[in-house]
């Protein structure tokens, strides 16, 4: 019996009946065994076939076998109802070997030429299966020359049998208070050869409840309890199951916060599995009763572990824990059924006693001492000497706990001193220096340092003066002794003020003329305004109309009098403004350097002399009456003049204040 080629030799070739293409002899038996490599099969087809036909091919035949299975018994030339000839059919081995047997009996009625066949090895496509046959692989089948391999979808792993896909279904941990879990692929059939472990792990204090839902179908056995596939449920207290079959198991109240669900499957069966809906419960906390003027959110039928509520107060009420304010409040239910924080109160907002208003007072409008939400108070300033700046003084206790003005300001109003008030009424005539009476020059400030000088009160904590008068003290402001509210220079009865800082105009150069001879002194405390201490006004933009040539201004001070001594009593003099060109010309001749009088100066005095300010008056104010506002304002600051005060043809020279309004305002706002 000739053997065909065996792998690893090339597997292909030709087979023919003995004597082909001549007729074959009687009593012949020939057998060929063809062997292909593993993973290959043999393909065989006939190019010529002519054998004696007999019933069921009993006489002459060609038989094809693969292993124990007969693939075909062939005879004749064409197939009949009971006999088969190969025709154009191709035959395939079942495995990698194919046996071909040719036999002829003892006689032939006529000559037959036998057969010719060709064969070759070809790759088996193991992935191709006949209908109704089990698939080669569970999930994906991959054919290659000489073999195949299986692979699995995500979430599965190839079993060691190399064909089955076992589910990767362990290690899932459910931590939500409720959820669903099911067998892999549910409601499609669950995978074979799988071992699944699911954990429900909730915080201590919760108890898990398991409900089987929809359908339950796990392979079972009529006599033995779940021998094939099964579901088990384990808690720290007990084990439930195993479960299998088609009946939904009853609800399981585990009384545990941790549950392990195990599902094991074998290699056979086609069942849809199971689905569990789990919930949890815990010891409820006492129902939260909202405090008066507050409400609870969210509103629930019950509150259990980890549930929370917040308290919100009505407008005008605030959260308080005793005396302590809270912006928000949230309580959380604990495992022992108690809330983690005590209920706060919603107390009516209390803005508290309003702050005292310097130089003013406050009146309770809603009721005596009422400071709660929507209460109204009215601030007012001390009449005559103070006026309220910006707002109307009406404040309401708002929901944020602050007293708030109608303009939305939370800061106190400001009582600003009224400026330019004087007890003096001016006469039109000019006459000699006179003694001042109480209240005539309430802005007058006496400055004692190295020398005697003067100044004028601005607002309630600034003094306007000449730069040359305080230049020596610019770095030692505390050395300045500032007195006000007195007429007598040497009187012990005065209001004392001290300097916090001295601001000399940056354009002033000491001992080099008197241009920019202006300075401000900041007082370390505000002074109390009264009839004897009142600030002077700064000039308005329109003030120039009250300071034209020949308009009368008033200078006051304790400077040298005609007798050559400092005045004991405050003196004043009414003097007219002198034409600027006339004044400039008066100081053009020696001993005065050219340009002594600048545009930052104004001059006042009589051509005939005799009325003037003098040494010791320096820094004092030359004031004018604004007839529209009926307030006095500072037009000039006593600066310099002729060596001999009151000299005919010479005039007193004053710093022109209106030129310095921006400088004054900047210093005061910045400091």
């Amino acid at each position: 019996t000739p053997l065909g080629p065996k792998w690893p030799e090339p597997v292909f070739g030709r087979l023919a009946s003995p004597g082909f293409p001549g007729e074959y002899a009687n009593d012949q038996e020939r057998r060929w065994t063809l062997t292909a490599p593993p993973g290959y099969r043999l393909r065989l087809y006939f190019t010529h076939f002519d054998l004696e036909l007999s019933h069921l091919c009993e006489y002459d035949f060609v038989k094809l076998s693969s292993g124990a299975k007969v693939l075909a018994t062939l005879c004749g030339q064409e197939s009949t109802d009971t006999e088969r000839a190969p025709g154009k059919d191709t035959f395939y081995s079942l495995g990698s070997s194919l046996d071909i047997t040719f036999r002829s009996d003892y006689s032939n009625e006529k000559p037959f030429t036998g057969f010719e066949a060709f064969y070759a090895a070809e790759d088996i496509d193991e992935c191709q299966v006949a209908p109704g046959e089990a698939p080669t692989c569970d999930h994906h089948c991959h054919n290659h020359l000489g073999g195949f391999y299986c692979s699995c979808r995500a979430g599965y792993v190839l079993h060691r049998n190399k064909r089955t896909c076992s589910a990767l279904c362990s290690g899932q941990v459910f931590t939500q208070r409720s959820g669903e879990l099911s067998s892999p692929e549910y409601p499609r059939p669950y995978p074979k050869l799988s071992s699944c472990t699911y954990s429900i792990s909730l915080e201590e204090g919760f108890s898990v409840i398991l409900d089987f839902v929809e359908s339950f179908d796990v392979e079972t056995h009529p006599e033995t309890l779940c021998p094939y596939d099964f579901l088990k449920i384990q808690t720290d207290r007990e084990e439930h199951g195993p479960f299998c079959g088609k009946t939904l198991p009853h609800r399981i109240e585990t009384k545990s916060n941790t549950v392990t669900i195990t599902f094991v499957t074998d290699e056979s069966g086609d069942h849809t599995g199971w689905k569990i809906h789990y919930t949890s419960t815990a010891q409820p906390c006492p129902y939260p009763m909202a405090p008066p003027n507050g409400h609870v959110s969210p509103v629930q039928a019950k509150y259990i572990l980890k549930d929370s509520f917040s308290i919100f107060c009505e407008t005008g009420y605030e959260l308080l824990q005793g005396h302590l304010p809270l912006k928000s409040f949230t309580a959380v239910c604990q495992k022992d059924g108690s809330w983690d924080r005590p209920m706060p109160a919603c107390s009516i907002v209390d803005c508290g006693p309003p702050d005292d208003l310097p130089s003013g007072r406050v009146e309770y409008i809603t009721g005596p001492g009422v400071t709660t939400y929507k209460a109204v108070i009215q601030y007012s300033c001390e009449e005559t000497f103070y006026t309220m700046k910006v707002n109307d003084g009406k404040y309401v206790c708002e929901a944020d706990g602050f007293w708030t003005s109608s303009k939305g300001e939370k800061s106190l109003p400001v009582c600003e001193p009224v400026c330019g008030l004087s007890a003096r009424t001016t006469g039109g005539r000019i006459y000699g220096g006179q003694k001042a009476k109480p209240g005539d020059f309430p802005w007058q400030v006496l400055i004692l340092g190295g020398t005697t000088a003067a100044g004028a009160l601005l607002y309630d904590n600034w003094v306007l003066t000449a730069a040359h008068a305080v230049y020596e003290q610019k770095h030692d402001a505390s050395a300045l002794d500032i007195r006000m509210g007195t007429l007598k220079r040497l009187s012990p009865h005065y209001t004392q003020a001290w300097s916090e800082a001295v601001f000399i105009h940056e354009g002033y150069t000491h001992d080099a003329g008197f241009d920019n001879d202006i300075a401000l002194i900041k007082l370390n405390n505000k002074v109390v305004i009264n009839s004897n201490i009142t600030p002077i006004c700064l000039p308005r933009k329109e003030a120039e109309s009250f300071m034209r040539t020949d308009d009368i201004g008033t200078a006051s001070g304790w400077g040298l009098t005609q007798r050559g001594f400092l005045a004991r009593n405050l003196m004043y003099v009414d003097i007219p403004i002198v034409d600027h060109q006339k004044c400039t010309a008066a100081y053009e001749k020696p001993p005065y350097p050219r340009g002594s009088v600048t545009a930052n100066m104004l001059c006042a005095g009589l051509e005939s002399g005799g009325k003037d300010s003098c040494r010791g008056d320096s820094g004092g104010a030359l004031v004018f009456l604004d007839s529209e506002t009926e307030r006095w304002f500072v037009g000039g600051i006593v600066s310099w003049g002729s060596m001999n005060c009151g000299e005919a043809g010479q005039y007193g020279v004053y710093t022109k204040v209106i030129n310095y309004i921006p400088w004054i305002e900047n210093i005061i706002s910045d400091f």
Partner: antibody, heavy 114, light 107 residues
Framework: QLQLQESGPGLVKPSETLSLTCTVS?????????WNWIRQPPGKGLEWIGY???????SYNPSLKSRVTISRDTSKNQFSLKLSSVTAADTAVYYC???????WGQGTLVTVSS | DIQMTQSPSSLSASVGDRVTITCRAS??????VAWYQQKPGKAPKALIY???YRESGVPSRFSGSGSGTDFTLTISSLQPEDFATYFC?????????FGGGTKVEIK
């Protein structure tokens, strides 16, 4: 985590003003709660000075109200204490604390002496 | 002002003992009371707030009770680290006030 830290001079002269600052980290002082100053004279008990709330409102111990100012700087997450006209009786360890006292600073000793 | 009267002002006890400290308010403060532990040179540490609520991280051997005017701090089994001074505080009304303290010493 929430921390409070007091800072300021350890020595103040009589009649002057004591100034301390509490720097808060790990929590915004505008988020919630009252932010307190509390003091403890050496070997003695605790005395509440006052608080500034998350909204900026203040509450002071009436016995100190005329001398106390509590303010805050929200950009630096700090609140401050000023106690004017101090005397030797104001010598104490000064603490800042949140709410009723769930968190405290470590305290700073302020001695009033010339 | 509300006075918080603490008693005793000092006590001696052994490790494992049950210790009770009381605090009496001069007027009703609801449950707005806190208890503190203070060790030498350290800031007070909150133990209990709102009369009976334990601060997080505080051992369960510390408990508080009471409402209105009478309050109690109990240490169920005294430990070596519990020897310290204990203060009560009311935060019900302005001014917030503290008890005079109870010094717990080793017997």
């Amino acid at each position: 985590q929430l921390q409070l830290q007091e800072s300021g001079p350890g020595l103040v002269k009589p009649s002057e003003t004591l100034s301390l600052t509490c720097t808060v980290s790990g929590y915004s002082i505008t988020s919630d709660y009252a932010w307190n100053w509390i003091r403890q004279p050496p070997g003695k008990g605790l005395e509440w000075i006052g608080y500034i709330s998350y909204s900026g409102r203040t509450s002071y111990n009436p016995s100190l109200k005329s001398r106390v100012t509590i303010s805050r700087d929200t950009s630096k997450n700090q609140f401050s204490l000023k106690l004017s006209s101090v005397t030797a009786a104001d010598t104490a360890v000064y603490y800042c604390a949140r709410h009723y006292g769930d968190y405290w600073g470590q305290g700073t000793l302020v001695t009033v002496s010339s | 002002d509300i006075q918080m009267t603490q008693s005793p002002s000092s006590l001696s006890a052994s490790v494992g003992d049950r210790v009770t400290i009381t605090c009496r308010a001069s007027q009703n403060v609801g449950t707005n009371v806190a208890w503190y532990q203070q060790k030498p040179g350290k800031a007070p540490k909150a133990l209990i707030y709102s009369a009976s609520y334990r601060e997080s991280g505080v051992p369960s051997r510390f408990s508080g009770s009471g409402s209105g005017t009478d309050f109690t701090l109990t240490i169920s089994s005294l430990q070596p680290e519990d020897f310290a001074t204990y203060f009560c505080q009311q935060f019900n009304t302005n001014p917030l006030t503290f008890g005079g303290g109870t010094k717990v010493e080793i017997k």
